[in-house]
Interface confidence: medium
């Protein structure tokens, strides 16, 4: 249904001025004016404010060419001043003016709240010419009005660089309250006060607010919008909403859940990603955060060994990523691992414990009593050593790695040999004569290569000069290795 503009104001004394399609009779009562050149605003009274001078919409044309007759002043006819309608209804209103035929190219534009309405608006201007004047009716229609259509609409007409402005037509779109601020979901500390805000607007105003907690109204009497609800504290989760009421009805906000912060749930699915001799890489799935962000996590590690003292190693780490590399562990050891995380309220319980093992470690000591001597007849170097005293965690010995470096004038060459675990001697071919050979030996297990022994040097003379004295590593506690030639 189209809401047609209808005058609701009290009647005013009007000059007759018939106009096709006019919504209201003309109102052009003017003070008596002298002949003027050009246009001047004329003093007139607005029907919306009786008795108050009104100067905004009248232009006085100069005399005709004959100079005998004063043309009537130009003014928009008065129409309805205020249209009230519901959202989604259609509305049509107009302004009209009678313009002497001496004026050409008159155009009417529509303005809303001081801005010209251009483009996709339904504005139609109709012309009704007569002998002396042309009646112009400018209609403006809005289909399915919205709140954004509220405002003051005026017509403007330009004639000879003068502007004639109509009285405003106020459009008021009424509807159910419209929320400009709704309560937001929150996570709050138990028994701690917090505020919720609700704001809604009309028209029609005023808008009043009822608060609802878990389907029960909180305030017996409504509060004028905006309303701030102070909740003294909660012990359990609650759902709040607000109802905005005006004359037209009520609108209910979204329901928001207010959660009580709690300690997190324990992490789950602790997994082993990688184990080495001295480290284990773990990951976990965080538990529920208790409505408060995780701050950090704690990885707890217990050695599973009847002989261990049962102490727990604790490694603190950030809450994200949900992964941690536990270091400084013993090789070939069994561990029980659990994870706990904390938020602002406190620590979660520990996750289910999982078992994990480190792999064999590399030997921690080098072979002992390394001796090196030259066997010139065979043109090789004899190397002997003693098996190191490795710990159980190093795992089973699988062999030895021998490093021999040959150095002579400006040349240095390192070679590596691998020998089996049952050996305690090896022979290497002489690579260079008139050079120094430096030998180091390391024990090897599945866990890796242990430390190399201290270097033992032997000089390899040119052919024909032989020294059978061996070179060796010193006994423990002795000074640096001695080179014997």
């Amino acid at each position: 249904a189209i809401t047609e503009a209808r005058e609701e104001a009290k009647p005013y004394p009007l000059f007759p001025g018939p106009l096709p399609g006019s919504l209201q009779t003309d109102h052009t009562s003017l003070l008596s004016l002298p002949h003027t050149s050009g246009y001047q605003p004329a003093l007139m009274f607005s029907p919306t404010q009786p008795g108050r001078p009104y100067t905004g919409n009248v232009a006085i044309p100069r005399v005709t060419s004959a100079g005998s007759k004063l043309l009537p002043p130009l003014a928009f006819k008065h129409t309805v001043g205020h249209i009230i309608l519901s959202e989604h209804k259609d509305v049509k209103f107009n302004c009209s003016i009678s313009v002497p035929n001496i004026y050409q190219d008159t155009t009417i534009s529509w303005w809303k709240d001081g801005k010209e309405l251009l483009g996709a608006h339904h504005a139609i201007t109709q012309f009704y010419p007569d002998d002396e004047v042309t009646a112009i009716i400018a209609s403006f229609s809005i289909t399915s009005v919205q709140r954004s259509d509220n405002g003051s609409y005026i017509c403007k007409m330009k004639i000879n660089n003068e502007e004639i402005v109509s009285d405003p037509i106020y459009i008021e779109v009424q509807g159910l309250p419209h929320f400009t601020k709704q309560p937001e979901s929150m996570n709050v500390t138990r028994n701690t006060a917090f505020n919720l805000t609700c704001q809604a607007v009309g028209p029609p105003e005023p808008v009043n607010i009822f608060w609802v907690q878990n389907s029960s109204r909180v305030n017996e009497q409504p509060e004028k919008s905006p309303s701030v609800l102070t909740v003294p504290g909660l012990t359990e989760m609650a759902v709040f909403s607000c109802e905005a009421h005006n004359d037209k009805g009520l609108t209910v906000s979204k329901g928001v859940q207010i959660n009580i912060k709690a300690i997190p749930s324990p992490p789950t699915e602790v997994s082993i990603h990688n184990s080495t001799a001295h480290s284990i890489l773990i990951s976990w799935v965080p538990g529920f955060d208790g409505y408060s962000p995780f701050r950090n996590c704690s990885v707890q590690v217990k050695e599973v060994d009847p002989l261990s003292n049962g102490s727990v190693m604790i490694f603190n780490t950030s809450a994200s990523p949900h992964m941690y590399q536990i270091k400084q562990l013993q090789a070939l050891a069994n561990y029980s691992i659990g994870v706990s995380c904390m938020n602002e309220i406190g620590w979660s319980a520990v996750s289910p414990w999982i078992l994990a093992s480190t792999t064999e470690g590399a030997p921690s000591v080098a072979p002992l009593n390394v001796t090196v001597f030259l066997n010139e007849s065979r043109d090789n170097v004899d190397i002997r050593w003693m098996k190191p005293l490795t710990k159980r965690q190093a795992g089973e010995l699988v062999g030895y790695r021998i490093s021999h470096v040959w150095q002579s004038a400006g040349i240095s060459k390192e070679l590596l040999e691998e020998v089996g675990q049952n050996n305690s001697r090896a022979q290497i071919s002489v690579q260079v004569h008139n050079a120094t050979c430096t030998v180091r030996i390391a024990a090897v297990t599945k866990g890796g290569v242990g430390p190399f022994s201290d270097p033992v040097k032997i000089f390899i003379p040119a052919h024909g000069w032989v020294d059978h004295a061996p070179s060796s590593t010193p006994a423990p506690g002795n000074a640096d290795p001695v080179l014997i030639i």
Epitope: I84, K89, P204, F210, H245, D247, L250
Partner: antibody, heavy 124, light 107 residues
């Protein structure tokens, strides 16, 4: 004080129309929904619809839309209900009713004020 | 639309007796009101918003309920309480619906 004064009894023939009125006083007529309620003899209450005189907005009970037309005249603070294509089933007392305040919807407070009722009799 | 079922349809009570009548909704309602109507008169708002007594209503009356189940109770029946009582609901949108009524008679 708030008063809702309804028009007198009506005797109408089947198929005809009737327009009954409810004149309001003691409050700002344009700012409160006016509801209409039907009560057949010995039966319960049935909501027909409502009108907001401020802008002419209306709501109707689905099955009565089209048969009942609600209007309001702000200048005389009078609400009207026109019933068309009347049948014997439309013989009833018709009440106008409204809530109590301007500031919240009558769904919160119910119908505080009622007219005295208009008897409509449909008879051949 | 929401259907309201009142029970019992008719009941009688002796003076001083406690009376309870119920109103069951086909789905959850936001607002429930009760009206009293005596023969040949307009209905009167009796209880609104579930439990608030209308002006002039005796404290012997009380209302309670939530969701789909509501009741009106008279703690001590008096002769003037004999009438028909209607429950009325209004949720988020029209239509408003009334129950069929409970007729309370004096024994």
């Amino acid at each position: 004080q708030v008063q809702l004064q309804q028009s007198g009894p009506e005797l109408v023939k089947p198929g005809a129309s009737v327009k009954i009125s409810c004149k309001a006083s003691g409050y700002e007529f344009s700012r409160s929904w006016m509801n209409w309620v039907k009560q057949r003899p010995g039966k319960g209450l049935e909501w027909i619809g409502r009108i907001y005189p401020g802008d002419g907005d209306t709501n109707y009970k689905g099955k009565l839309k089209g048969q009942a037309t609600l209007t309001a005249d702000k200048s005389s603070s009078t609400a009207y209900m026109q019933l068309s294509s009347l049948t014997f089933e439309d013989s009833a007392v018709y009440f106008c009713a409204r809530g109590g305040g301007y500031y919240y919807d009558s769904r919160y407070e119910g119908f505080v004020y009622w007219g005295q009722g208009t008897v409509v009799t449909v008879s051949a | 639309q929401i259907v309201l079922t009142q029970s019992p349809a008719i009941m009688s009570a002796s003076p001083g007796e406690e009376v309870t009548m119920t109103c069951s909704a086909s789905s959850s309602v936001s607002y429930m009101h009760w009206y009293q109507q005596k023969s040949g008169t307009s209905p009167k708002r009796w209880i609104y918003d579930t439990s608030k007594l209308a002006s002039g209503v005796s404290g012997r009356f009380s209302g309670s309920g939530s969701g789909t189940s509501y009741s009106l109770t008279i703690s001590s029946m008096e002769a003037e309480d004999a009438a028909t009582y209607y429950c009325q609901q209004w949720s988020s949108n029209p239509p408003i619906t009334f129950g069929a009524g409970t007729k309370l008679e004096l024994k």
